[in-house]
Interface confidence: low
């Protein structure tokens, strides 16, 4: 499959529109601070060059790798040193080190202004005036804020974004039509970004085999009728796609993802009965649909797992001959029988099974040694089941906002060194597990909850990695990908933490809080709650509840006052004094 010119190959495969969009995403994910106009200029130059290579693959520089071409282009940016500091040193390196260097400088929390949504009429005018620029700007703004966003999926989001404006800008009530669609795209986009970030962290921090193990388990749950060999082929191809996207090879990634969707649809009879509708859709919708497709029904009369993996006298022989294949088969067989388990639980079971075989196959009587291995699974299964039961009960009792607050207090006490914005963001997202998963029946709760928590805790891990402040977070994040959640769950109050000095400024509020949306007001209150816990880690739930109730009443009272600012100043002092007294600060 060798091509004289890689850039010509990808241009022809993807078409000009997708080629330009993907190059823009790639550049914006690498150089997150560069102005939009600079990126557009670079993309246009690359596109013109690609066209010359399509016309003549032997033309000068057309044989260069995409990393070389794109890296050379990025290194022409005049302000690289001033804007990015040490990232400019990447340009002194040769490929592949240069690309690795760019990847290492991707920033999960770039210092960029919050995206403020203009008035609907303003957006519709901009959309009509220059649709192409408007959509490019969307790709650019999302890509630079989410440097690991799954690029082919971002094309799908852009397509939906365009459809929303096309439809709603001609509607009688533009805002009523457009705003819910934009909210939905924003929320789905954040979720998509976080899910992809976990895939990239899995590949980059724990290696290809970690990702493959995850993929075997997930695809076996989704396609339980598919043969092991079929699942293995899909895992290999899916791993290639995500390795490319996480490595910045977005053209190859999008091309290979399209090939994988094509293969799945051509072979759906041997994969899943649930793919029919997906496979009738256009490419971007098809790929998205396949990625989200519901689990197929389990085949009837699957035999007991014990026969092949415990009772057989050939267990150690089969394991020794091909450890990877044997463990892969175990994971496949277990996962296809258990759509009710989370992927991380399935991986913990596989790890336990592997550890047992490593020990027992070297023992005098291997069969006797591993005969009870499935008994070791019971506590591993019960732990997440019990945790989810307890937390769903708490969620149903408190509602989302107060459930988030309970988690805020819990996690601030566990890891008080973590920055307040990170604790608020992560705990709010952890709290969303309630409304997302607790409504499901028992059989769907664990895969929903624990795999979602893995995604959220990965956000904590990547944000913490940028500025590490807690050994406990580092330990839970790096020791084992599949045990991150149990590791955080097991953390108790950090007794070594020295409480923060009290700073009245932290608890000073102004009238601007009254004009905030309900969500932003909640974030303000939750920020104050985290700070309270950091000042008084030993505060009881009752003490914190009393202070937060007073705080809510204070905000409500002052937002109704005629002179709001004076109210906030005077009542705020009283509130701080009362809170200090209540907490013994």
């Amino acid at each position: 499959d060798a091509h004289k010119s890689e850039v010509a190959h990808r241009f022809k495969d993807l078409g000009e529109e997708n080629f330009k969009a993907l190059v823009l995403i790639a550049f914006a994910q690498y150089l997150q601070q560069c102005p939009f106009e600079d990126h557009v200029k670079l993309v246009n130059e690359v596109t013109e060059f690609a066209k010359t290579c399509v016309a003549d693959e032997s033309a000068e520089n057309c044989d260069k790798s995409l990393h070389t071409l794109f890296g050379d282009k990025l290194c022409t940016v005049a302000t690289l040193r001033e804007t990015y500091g040490e990232m400019a040193d990447c340009c002194a390196k040769q490929e592949p080190e240069r690309n690795e260097c760019f990847l290492q400088h991707k920033d999960d929390n770039p210092n960029l202004p919050r995206l403020v949504r203009p008035e609907v009429d303003v957006m519709c005018t901009a959309f009509h005036d220059n649709e192409e620029t408007f959509l490019k700007k969307y790709l650019y703004e999302i890509a630079r804020r989410h440097p690991y966003f799954y690029a082919p999926e971002l094309l799908f989001f852009a397509k939906r974004y365009k459809a929303a404006f096309t439809e709603c800008c001609q509607a009688a009530d533009k805002a009523a039509c457009l705003l819910p669609k934009l909210d939905e795209l924003r929320d789905e986009g954040k979720a998509s970004s976080a899910k992809q970030r976990l895939k990239c962290a899995s590949l980059q921090k724990f290696g290809e085999r970690a990702f493959k193990a995850w993929a075997v388990a997930r695809l076996s749950q989704r396609f339980p009728k598919a043969e092991f060999a079929e699942v293995s082929k899909l895992v290999t191809d899916l791993t290639k796609v995500h390795t490319e996207c996480c490595h910045g090879d977005l053209l190859e990634c999008a091309d290979d993802r399209a090939d994988l969707a094509k293969y799945i649809c051509e072979n759906q009879d041997s994969i899943s009965s649930k793919l029919k509708e997906c496979c009738e859709k256009p490419l971007l919708e098809k790929s998205h649909c396949i990625a989200e497709v519901e689990n197929d029904e389990m085949p009837a009369d699957l035999p007991s797992l014990a026969a092949d993996f415990v009772e057989s006298k050939d267990v150690c022989k089969n394991y020794a001959e091909a450890k990877d294949v044997f463990l892969g088969m175990f994971l496949y067989e277990y996962a296809r029988r258990h759509p009710d388990y989370s992927v991380v639980l399935l991986l913990r079971l596989a790890k336990t099974y592997e550890t047992t075989l490593e020990k027992c196959c070297a023992a005098a009587d291997p069969h006797e040694c591993y005969a009870k291995v499935f008994d070791e699974f019971k506590p591993l299964v019960e732990e997440p089941q019990n945790l989810i039961k307890q937390n769903c009960e708490l969620f149903e009792q408190l509602g989302e906002y107060k459930f988030q607050n309970a988690l805020l207090v819990r996690y601030t006490k566990k890891v008080p060194q973590v920055s307040t914005p990170t604790l608020v963001e992560v705990s709010r997202n952890l709290g969303k597990v309630g409304s997302k998963c607790c409504k499901h029946p028992e059989a769907k709760r664990m895969p929903c909850a624990e795999d979602y928590l893995s995604v959220v805790l990965n956000q904590l891990c990547v944000l913490h990695e940028k500025t590490p402040v807690s050994d406990r977070v580092t330990k839970c994040c790096t020791e084992s990908l599949v045990n991150r959640r149990p590791c955080f769950s097991a953390l108790e109050v950090d007794e070594t933490y020295v409480p923060k000095e009290f700073n009245a400024e932290t608890f000073t509020f102004h009238a601007d809080i009254c004009t905030l949306s309900e969500k932003e007001r909640q974030i303000k209150k939750q920020t104050a709650l985290v700070e309270l816990v950091k000042h008084k880690p030993k505060a009881t739930k009752e003490q914190l509840k009393a202070v937060m109730d007073d705080f809510a009443a204070f905000v409500e009272k002052c937002c109704k006052a005629d002179d709001k600012e004076t109210c906030f100043a005077e009542e705020g002092k009283k509130l701080v004094a009362a809170s200090q007294a209540a907490l013994g600060l």
């Epitope: 899995s202 724990f206 290696g207 995850w214 075997v216 450890k323 790890k351 592997e354 084992s480």
Partner: nanobody, 122 residues
């Protein structure tokens, strides 16, 4: 029989450089992720760096990032660690170690070398 043999250790001044090598035999080297692990005198083992089977993925501990570079030559069944800007705290026995797990979602090693001593002192 699986064998891992490290070499290249020695005494070096702070700021200096060393290149460690690990010669592998007795297994298909190109199928395995490989690692460097070290143990400072009186301290626990510390993972230093790992490289995937084809050499496409490289991960390093924060303490050595930007100073140490892991690499491999599958044709020569060899693993390397280029150590630059050495510091006193880099002193210790350096081991090369094989990662056995085909579905390895954790850092775990099944075979180790006997180690090579690196001493950084003025």
């Amino acid at each position: 029989e699986v064998q891992l043999l490290e070499s290249g250790g020695g005494l070096v001044k702070p700021g200096g450089s060393l290149r460690l090598s690990c010669a592998a035999s007795g297994f298909t080297f190109s199928n395995y992720n490989m690692n460097w692990v070290r143990q400072a005198p009186g301290k626990r083992l510390e993972w230093v760096s790992s490289i995937s089977s084809a050499g496409t993925h490289i991960y390093s501990a924060d303490s050595v990032k930007g100073r140490f570079t892991i690499s491999r030559d599958n044709a020569k069944n060899s693993l390397y660690l280029q150590m630059n800007s050495l510091r006193a705290e880099d002193t210790g026995v350096y081991y090369c170690a094989r990662d056995p797990h085909s579905t390895g979602w954790y850092k775990d090693f099944d075979y180790w070398g006997q180690g090579t001593l690196v001493t950084v002192s003025s």
